[in-house]
């Protein structure tokens, strides 16, 4: 089968890192500088990604795999394969078209990326606010007044996965 296939297509035996070179009577040639082929049987090699500007090289290009980029300090990756770099903000801020802006009252962001989210509404769960929220931190909900019988002291931080304002199903 291998012999039959290679008679039909001389390119099928070209390994990753080479290409089937029409200029050389379809024999396998090594990929040229700054290019790669990650699979066998390729008729061209792909140009290596170049990590320039705000991108920096996380993994060099080789003849069989593309370069991988990440972002310079102060920026973070967005998109598949780090296709974009977005500016970091401080905790308590979000990135807008005009740059980093503090979270509005009643919202918080505990990361250097993403948007400000509303504080958890403790009363929706029948609970009280134990620790007030800040720009950087969500509120901490405490037990409901009915739970405050002697000897009971269960402090429940809000579940981070639940969307604010929604009560459990």
């Amino acid at each position: 089968f291998e012999r039959t296939r290679s008679l039909q297509d001389p390119c099928s035996n070209c390994p990753a890192g080479t290409f089937c070179d029409n200029n050389r009577n379809q024999i396998c040639s090594p990929c040229p500088p700054n290019s790669f082929s990650s699979a066998g049987g390729q008729r061209t090699c792909d140009i290596c990604r170049q990590c320039k500007g705000v991108f920096r090289t996380r993994k060099e290009c080789s003849s069989t795999s593309n370069a991988e980029c990440d972002c310079t300090p102060g920026f973070h990756c967005l998109g598949a394969g780090c296709s974009m770099c977005e500016q970091d903000c401080k905790q308590g801020q979000e990135l807008t078209k005009k740059g980093c802006k503090d979270c509005c009252f009643g919202t918080f962001n505990d990361q250097k990326r993403g948007i400000c989210r509303p504080w958890t509404n403790c009363s929706l769960d029948g609970k009280s606010v134990l620790v007030n929220g800040t720009k950087e931190r969500d509120v901490v909900c405490g037990p409901s007044p009915a739970d405050l019988s002697p000897g009971a002291s269960s402090v429940t931080p809000p579940a981070p996965a639940r969307e604010p304002g929604h009560s459990p199903q």
């Epitope: 070179d21 200029n23 050389r24 040639s29 090594p30 040229p32 500088p33």
Partner: nanobody, 121 residues
Framework: AVQLVESGGGLVQPGGSLRLSCAAS????????MAWYRQAPGKQRDFVAS???????IYADSVKGRFTISRDNAKNTTYLQMNSLKPEDTAVYYC???????????????WGQGTQVTVSS
């Protein structure tokens, strides 16, 4: 131009080893890659292994783990160490040098005269 002279071929038993050498002379400063190919009677010339000026190596699947390509810059020589040889490795082995890439093709493409490798008991 680049001149290439291969040596080291011969008759060897299955499971044996050989080391082929390819000595380059001439305009060797412009070599981007050195490669070994082989051609059995009535077959096309097949890629075996290559090594670039940066030291990156590539092997055909059929020889991976058995053959090793290397080079000695001081001697302008490229080697192909062949271990665990099989009868199907029998072929004429050719050394090839490729010049720099001009965007569409390699600027030059030189071949040695070939050296016969026969694997037989």
């Amino acid at each position: 131009a680049v001149q290439l002279v291969e040596s080291g071929g011969g008759l060897v038993q299955p499971g044996g080893s050989l080391r082929l050498s390819c000595a380059a002379s001439g305009s060797i400063f412009s070599i981007y890659a050195m490669a070994w190919y082989r051609q059995a009677p009535g077959k096309q010339r097949d890629f075996v292994a290559s090594i670039t000026s940066g030291g990156s190596t590539i092997y055909a699947d059929s020889v991976k783990g058995r053959f090793t390509i290397s080079r000695d810059n001081a001697k302008n020589t490229t080697y192909l160490q062949m271990n665990s040889l099989k009868p199907e490795d029998t072929a004429v082995y050719y050394c090839n040098s490729l010049g720099s890439w001009d965007g569409e093709r390699y600027e030059y493409d030189y071949w040695g005269q070939g050296t016969q490798v026969t694997v037989s008991s």
